[in-house]
């Protein structure tokens, strides 16, 4: 679709005659008819195929022609087709007489013709104005003419529709071929699709708008390149969506169940050994001067009753000293003056004489001991209770008092709250420090795993082209993993090719 | 070549909200190439564009509509959905979904069959 | 809001030509497609981007569009023409549907 323009510039007929050679009277009110047709080798009367326009009069025998265009006149004149411009035409341009006001070709007598002027040519679409005179014996006619494309049609043909748009189906100028040139940030084959944030992951992020990343399910990032992890992972990562791969010393289906409490709270105090000994519980060696469960409590050296055979302690600055009685001496009144003669076991102990009665030895009844059986057995010395257990002497024996979860002789054993097998539906129990959890096979949930829900997502295969499908449990839903090359939800579109469609 | 199915309640009081979905069959919904439109039409009258939204969840509404609907996607079904609150007898239309497509200029060369949705106690 | 004015009903005698209007303000410079509805049925795509016909819509249905002014012309029109059309545009991110035109073949 197009338009011919046609610029009548100046007409001389200097003589004010017809084409017969009769005068007009009292002047030749001159107005013009335009045949523009199809291209003849010989100009040739017949339909005015390309279309036809006629002037008001213009001027009287000799005048200019003003260009009105500007002001939406009638020059230059305006001969719009609706067809591929064929590059070649003929024009016929006639000058005719108006004696009166009625300018239709059935009004005027044959005879009012002034001049008719044929040409034939070829023409290319273009804003150039080609300028062209016509000369006969009594008339001269100065004119230009050109052919331009109608507004949204380009091309060499004026051929190509092409609108500028800025919506969602499409972002595009028009180039003066009619191709179509993309706005910033916009691409495809129709502009419509945005060119994401740069370095936007192909597969797991997308955009709506130029410069945007927005993550698909199980994504996040600026750039939608890091998983997100199961909900509820505590100290755990993913290297897929929903993961939860525990950090080291931790355990559990979300990473919360602290299997090194040793280096994640050191509770062990005054530089004792610690040692993790199950989830949540660890054991305290204290050195040498210390006691409690996590070796908070100071000994006075003398709380280990270091002097023998009833010698008295006493706490020094630098250790401690023991003030021995009679008939013992030594750092610890370990050595004795005494014989068996002199009944020096206590509490029932027997004596016997050793080195030809120089010297003695006490064996002691249960529960007593000592050189000389003077001390009563404490059965809490070596700290037999594991687990942080509180040791009592009760008599000749001795018991622990376990802390909360843990049971047996020596604390050792841990309460498992899994004996009762209180998980649903084959589901496997794990205990936990306050209580349990219930890790659910598929197709249920709850605490117990009484609820039953719906199957894996996943179950029936939904992604193309050998991804990796995972199951979304907070929606029951699937996220298709790609592999490089494969993009879409399913993964069935191969990258950097148009999707083809079976319809 | 591909069809459009709608389905939903024939019948939605008034004040609560009337919920259509468009299953897409022979072909997928995840293209760059189309977008998926709602078009009403209340009975002897003419058609009214609702809204549209691509396979990615870009969304666009009629702006006389847009307080009251959201046009959701579910590409692992092939469906795209339509949701409008508050209706009044005045939402009483056949509603439409459509393929738009792209190389049209937008022009819907896929239509759904219909469903007549009235809002009525 | 946009708007798209076509007039209510063409009538139109078989073999003769219908040409129905559809204006809005800077029309031309906006893609117009076409729908015909037949009673009971769902709307069909006749013209899409002005004038060109999608695969299967007969050569008598044509369509242009210039100024504030789109048409959608019928040469030869048949009684199985008889329905209504509707003018379609884009204006900005929202689709626009003129009110419809009834053509009825005498």
């Known amino acids: 679709s197009g338009v011919f323009q046609l610029q009548l510039q100046e007409f001389i007929n200097e003589r004010g005659v017809l084409a017969s050679g009769r005068p007009c009277e009292p002047g030749c009110r001159t107005f013009f008819r335009v045949c523009l047709k199809h291209f003849q080798a010989v100009v040739s009367p017949g339909p005015c195929t390309f279309g036809t326009v006629s002037t008001p009069v213009l001027g009287t025998n000799s005048f200019a022609v003003r260009d009105d265009s500007s002001g939406g006149g009638r020059n230059p004149l305006q001969l719009p087709f609706n067809f591929t411009w064929p590059g070649t035409f003929s024009l016929i341009i006639e000058a005719w007489h108006a004696p009166g006001d009625d300018l239709r070709p059935e009004a005027l007598p044959p005879d009012a013709l002034i001049s008719k002027i044929a040409i034939q040519g070829s023409l290319a679409v273009g804003q150039n104005w080609l300028l062209d005179e016509q000369t006969s014996t009594l008339t001269r006619l100065r004119y230009s003419y050109r052919v331009i494309c109608s507004d949204n049609y380009y091309g060499d043909n004026c051929s190509r529709l092409c609108k500028k748009r800025n919506d969602h189906f499409g972002h595009y100028v028009c180039q003066p071929d009619g191709n179509l040139s993309c706005l910033p940030g916009w691409t495809g084959e129709y502009c419509q699709q945005p060119i994401c944030l740069s370095g936007c992951h192909e597969q797991n992020g997308y955009c709506s708008k130029p410069a945007e990343c927005l993550c698909r399910p199980g994504w996040q990032g600026r750039l939608c390149n890091e998983c997100i992890p199961h909900n509820g992972c505590r100290h755990g990562t993913c290297s897929t969506p929903w993961q939860c791969t525990c950090d080291e010393g931790w355990g559990g289906l979300f990473c919360d169940q602290d299997l090194n409490y040793c280096t994640h709270h050191s509770p062990c105090k005054n530089g004792a050994t610690c040692s993790n000994s199950g989830q949540r519980s660890y054991t305290c060696t204290c050195r040498p001067g210390y006691t409690g469960v996590d070796c908070e409590l100071e000994l006075s050296e003398c709380d280990s009753n270091p002097c023998r055979n009833g010698g008295s302690c006493k706490d020094q600055e630098d250790g401690y000293h023991c003030l021995c009685p009679p008939g013992y001496y030594g750092l610890h009144c370990e050595h004795s003056t005494l014989s068996c003669a002199d009944s020096p076991c206590f509490n029932g102990g027997s004596c016997r004489e050793r080195n030809q009665g120089a010297n003695y030895a006490c064996e002691c009844p249960p529960n007593f001991t000592g050189s000389n059986c003077e001390k009563k057995v404490d059965r809490c010395t070596s700290n037999p209770c594991a687990n942080g257990g509180q040791c009592l002497n009760r008599g000749p024996s001795r018991m622990c008092r376990c802390r909360p979860g843990f049971t047996g002789t020596y604390c050792e054993l841990h309460v498992s709250d899994c004996a009762r097998n209180p998980c649903a539906h084959g589901g496997t129990c794990h205990d936990l420090e306050n209580g349990l959890m219930c890790t659910c096979p598929a197709g249920f949930s709850g605490r117990r795993c009484e609820v039953r829900t719906s199957i894996d997502a996943c179950a029936s295969s939904p992604c193309f082209n050998r991804a990796t499908c995972y199951t979304d449990l907070s929606t029951d839903t699937f996220v298709c993993n790609c592999p490089y090359g494969f993009v879409g939800s399913r993964c069935e579109f191969p990258v950097g090719l148009p999707p083809s469609f079976p319809w | 070549e591909v069809q459009l199915q709608e389905s939903g309640p024939g019948l939605v009081k008034p004040s609560e909200t009337l919920s259509l979905t468009c299953t897409v069959s022979?072909?997928?919904?995840?293209?760059?190439?189309?977008?998926w439109g709602w078009i009403r039409q209340p009975p002897g009258k003419g058609l009214e564009w609702i809204g549209d939204?691509?396979?990615?969840?870009?969304?666009y509404y009629n702006p006389s509509l847009k307080s009251r609907v959201t046009i959701s996607v579910d590409t692992s079904k092939n469906q795209f959905s339509l949701k409008l609150s508050s209706v009044t007898a005045a939402d009483t239309a056949v509603y439409y979904c459509?393929?738009?497509?792209?190389?049209?200029?937008?022009?819907?060369?896929?239509w759904g069959q219909g469903t007549l949705v009235t809002v009525s106690s | 809001s946009y708007e798209l004015t076509q007039p209510p009903s063409v009538s139109v005698s078989p073999g003769q030509t219908a040409s129905i209007t559809c204006s809005g303000e800077?029309?031309?410079?906006?893609?117009v497609s076409w729908y015909q509805q037949k009673p009971g049925q769902s709307p069909v795509l006749v013209i899409y981007?002005?004038?060109t016909r999608p695969s299967g819509i007969p050569e008598r249905f044509s369509g242009s569009n210039s100024g504030d002014t789109a048409t959608l012309t019928i040469s030869g029109t048949q009684p199985m023409d008889e329905a209504d059309y509707y003018c379609?545009?884009?204006?900005?991110?929202?689709?626009?549907f003129g009110s419809g035109t009834k053509v009825t073949v005498l």
């Open positions: 459509a393929r738009e497509a792209v190389a049209l200029g937008g022009g819907a060369d896929d």
């Open positions: 022979g072909g997928s919904i995840s293209s760059s190439n189309y977008y």
């Open positions: 939204i691509n396979y990615n969840g870009n969304t």
């Open positions: 800077g029309l031309g410079d906006k893609y």
């Open positions: 981007e002005d004038s």
């Open positions: 379609q545009a884009w204006d900005s991110e929202t689709g626009v």
